[in-house]
């Protein structure tokens, strides 16, 4: 029961152009090209997009025209391979152009860079931005798509269209406001933060599909959709999972036009069938397409249906469990996951998947045993420690967060994770630990029933960032092991890591701890990052340093920065006081 059109089209490019409309077509092609060729200048991409668009129009006019029958991968790949500087700019990626489809597209996908060497996006003055917006709105918005897409090569393309729409609305409103900055800056901050979160969530979906396969993604989707739509029956959830898997497979595979088109179809189907899906969809379904799709993706869990009987009867107490499992494994396990998830909106998706895996493993073992029923009779007892582990961890960490506040909680995690995996680059450890620390303000405010799904599923997203960054330049076998062994056990794997006793402390380098007056003009966030970078380096130099030692050094460091930033001659203060601080820190840590 798929919702997607299966009829063949003479010209795929004409089909998608007609379905999506010119504006969305051009935006999606620009995103696709920027996600593949992340270093190319904006103007080059715009030129390529315009050429593709003109070609698409000829195909709309006559689907039998020359080359109109070619696949989108062939058309887009051919276009990308016309870039003159491909070899100089991208090195071995240029070798992709010698391949045929589908290998050529796979090759481009493999060269997507999660951490491209691009300058940080600096936000110009509000008046400068508003002038640029008014001078050429279309170019201004295209530039936004381009800059986000090239920095986030797995950003969910149809969702990026939604962000661009909000970006445009912010400028349209605020550039007319009396106080432009007061109106615009909070909106841009919100879009930036939401955009980073959206990118990271999508990166996990793509990693799930690409590294662990379709079955892993479908299991995740069954659990999440069953929690979200507990009144929907299994066949409905299964259908939504199949369609959602197709959408994300397409987007993660660079098939952005198909992905956006199919996502729109799925939103349409959900809204046409909301009575059998969820009572929470009404407001979403009254919105325009981009807002509607976003709203559905974020919709709150529906209320659990009344009269759900115990699962034990069908999945533990019945003597026919093995027969049902043997004759319909996927349906039986899918039904187990669906039934368990719809009863447990208070569990994280990854926990539900661990329970389902435990159940499957138990059946595999017990159904081959002499007395299967006796063997699997206590399987639900095996769930208890699996449930308690994240509950306890969240309780402890929320207590620590409430005690320390976000910045110091991040620091505690920085120390913890640097000691676990000290080989990982300092910028990665800072970025990942800062994001891990944000779980506190994001989730600890929630009541017990919402904490685990908030916290553990968020941690899965953040740890995936660590995994994809580490995969680019692997330095730690422990990280590789936790990242590759089991998608759902990544967080417990990292939690279980102790201090790496094999690590040889880093040589002391005074330059790492030399600071200048420029730190005084940084934002609070940037200043925190500088201090946290120093903290990671300290731990790398002295992995056995105690919490107390590190706290003392960091307190001294904060006082040093505050003192020198108030000094008349800041640079001299940083030079002289800095030397003293380094010496005192070395003494305090026994370096």
């Amino acid at each position: 029961r798929g919702v997607f059109r299966r009829d063949a089209h003479k010209s795929e490019v004409a089909h998608r152009f007609k379905d999506l409309g010119e504006e969305n077509f051009k935006a999606l092609v620009l995103i696709a090209f920027a996600q593949y060729l992340q270093q190319c200048p904006f103007e080059d991409h715009v030129k390529l997009v315009n050429e593709v668009t003109e070609f698409a129009k000829t195909c709309v006019a006559d689907e039998s025209a020359e080359n109109c029958d070619k696949s989108l991968h062939t058309l887009f790949g051919d276009k990308l391979c016309t870039v003159a500087t491909l070899r100089e700019t991208y090195g071995e990626m240029a070798d992709c152009c010698a391949k045929q489809e589908p290998e050529r597209n796979e090759c481009f996908l493999q060269h997507k860079d999660d951490n491209p060497n691009l300058p940080r996006l600096v936000r110009p003055e509000v008046d400068v931005m508003c002038t640029a917006f008014h001078d050429n709105e279309e170019t201004f918005l295209k530039k936004y798509l381009y800059e986000i897409a090239r920095r986030h090569p797995y950003f969910y393309a149809p969702e990026l269209l939604f962000f661009a729409k909000r970006y445009k609305a912010a400028f349209t409103e605020c550039c007319q406001a009396a106080d432009k900055a007061a109106c615009l800056l909070p909106k841009l901050d919100e879009l930036r933060d939401e955009g980073k979160a959206s990118s990271a969530k999508q990166r996990l979906k793509c990693a799930s599909l690409q590294k662990f396969g379709e079955r892993a993604f479908k299991a995740w989707a069954v659990a999440r959709l069953s929690q979200r739509f507990p009144k929907a029956e299994f066949a409905e959830v299964s259908k939504l999972v199949t369609d959602l898997t197709k959408v994300h497979t397409e987007c993660c595979h660079g098939d952005l036009l198909e992905c956006a088109d199919d996502r729109a179809d799925l939103a349409k189907y959900i809204c046409e069938n909301q009575d059998s899906i969820s009572s929470k969809l009404k407001e979403c379904c009254e919105k325009p397409l981009l807002e509607k799709s976003h709203c559905i993706a974020e919709v709150e869990n529906d209320e659990m249906p009344a009269d759900l009987p115990s699962l034990a009867a069908d999945f533990v107490e019945s003597k026919d469990v093995c027969k049902n499992y043997a004759e319909a494994k996927d349906v039986f396990l899918g039904m187990f996951l669906y039934e368990y998830a719809r009863r447990h909106p208070d569990y994280s998706v990854v926990l539900l998947l661990r329970l389902a895996k435990t159940y499957e493993t138990t059946l595999e073992k017990c159904c081959a045993a002499a007395d299967p029923h006796e063997c699997y009779a206590k399987v639900f007892d095996e769930f208890k420690p699996l449930v308690e582990e994240p509950q306890n961890l969240i309780k402890q960490n929320c207590e620590l967060f409430e005690q320390l506040g976000e910045y110091k909680f991040q620091n505690a995690l920085l120390v913890r994770y640097t000691k676990k995996v000290p080989q990982v680059s300092t910028p990665t450890l800072v970025e990942v630990s800062r994001n891990l620390g944000k779980v506190g303000s994001k989730c600890c405010k929630h009541p017990e029933a919402k904490r685990m799904p908030c916290a553990e599923d968020y941690l899965s997203v953040v740890l995936n960032q660590l995994c994809v960054l580490h995969e680019k330049t692997p330095v730690s076998d422990r990280v590789t092991k936790c990242c590759t062994e089991s998608l759902v056990n990544r967080r417990p794997c990292f939690s279980a890591l102790e201090v790496d006793e094999t690590y040889v402390p880093k040589e002391f380098n005074a330059e790492t701890f030399t600071f200048h007056a420029d730190i005084c003009t940084l934002s609070e966030k940037e200043r925190q990052i500088k201090k946290q970078t120093a903290l990671v380096e300290l731990v790398k130099h002295k992995p056995k340093a105690t919490k107390e030692q590190l706290k003392a050094v960091m307190d001294d460091f904060a006082a040093f920065v505050e003192k020198c930033c108030k000094a008349d001659d800041k640079e001299t203060c940083f030079a002289e006081e800095g030397k003293k601080l380094v010496a005192a820190s070395q003494a305090a840590l026994g370096l």
Epitope: S310, A313, E317
Partner: antibody, heavy 120, light 108 residues
């Protein structure tokens, strides 16, 4: 509206066959274990069998061999094929929906029933 | 397959009375027992499942208890619409299910 409607009942000669249908609306049959239950005039409820979400059919001991449960998901319809009918098979035949895909009970949703009379 | 013995098979009572019907299984069925009410010419209606859970929409004067082999259905204060036949059903021990013989509740 979520409902079950049985059809196909009637009068049949001993030794004859009959196929009952149960049309489901408002939900997908494939998501549930679907049951047939009968009730002879003035008597209690008697479970005949069910087909679960894995398309595996189970029967009461007395029903094995003569009765067959099947379903057509595309038509969203459940069937009960009854062969070698006897006078004691005279009853109202109900279809009922299990709580889940592999549930043998409880049955919250029932059809109104269809009457089968076996007599010469 | 297990058997369910319901008692009494018939019972007369008055409006306002407290009524108890029992159901005994030939082997343990944990808490997997349901109670139904049936009126003439109608299909059964689910009252209680998993021995003691009240189905939504069913008046709170109905309650169920028990586990293992012995179960009871109690109507705390009989109303005129409660005169009907009541059945217990055991499920979950295998992919088969069994109904009790029924209890006909009539006006005294």
């Amino acid at each position: 509206e979520v409902q079950l409607v049985e059809s196909g009942g009637g009068r049949v000669q001993p030794g004859g066959s009959l196929r009952l249908s149960c049309a489901a609306s408002g939900f997908s049959l494939s998501s549930y274990a679907m049951n047939w239950v009968r009730q002879a005039p003035g008597k209690g409820l008697e479970w005949i069998g069910h087909i679960n979400a894995g398309d595996i059919a189970y029967y009461a001991t007395w029903a094995k061999g003569r009765f067959t449960i099947s379903r057509d998901n595309s038509k969203n319809t459940l069937y009960l094929q009854m062969n070698s009918l006897r006078a004691e098979d005279t009853a109202t035949y109900f279809c009922a929906r299990g709580a889940g895909g592999f549930s043998t009970g409880p049955f919250k949703l029932w059809g109104q029933g269809t009457q089968v009379t076996v007599s010469s | 397959a297990f058997e369910l013995t319901q008692s009494p098979s018939s019972l007369s009572a008055s409006v306002g009375d407290r009524v108890t019907i029992t159901c005994r299984a030939s082997e343990s069925i944990n808490s997997r027992l349901a109670w139904y009410q049936q009126k003439p010419g109608q299909p059964p209606k689910l009252l209680i499942y998993d021995a003691s859970d009240l189905t939504s929409g069913v008046p709170s004067r109905f309650s169920g208890s028990g586990s293992g082999t012995d179960f009871t259905l109690t109507i705390s204060s009989l109303q005129p619409e409660d005169f009907a036949t009541y059945y217990c059903q055991g499920y979950g021990g295998s992919s088969t299910t069994t109904f009790g013989g029924g209890t006909k509740l009539t006006v005294l």
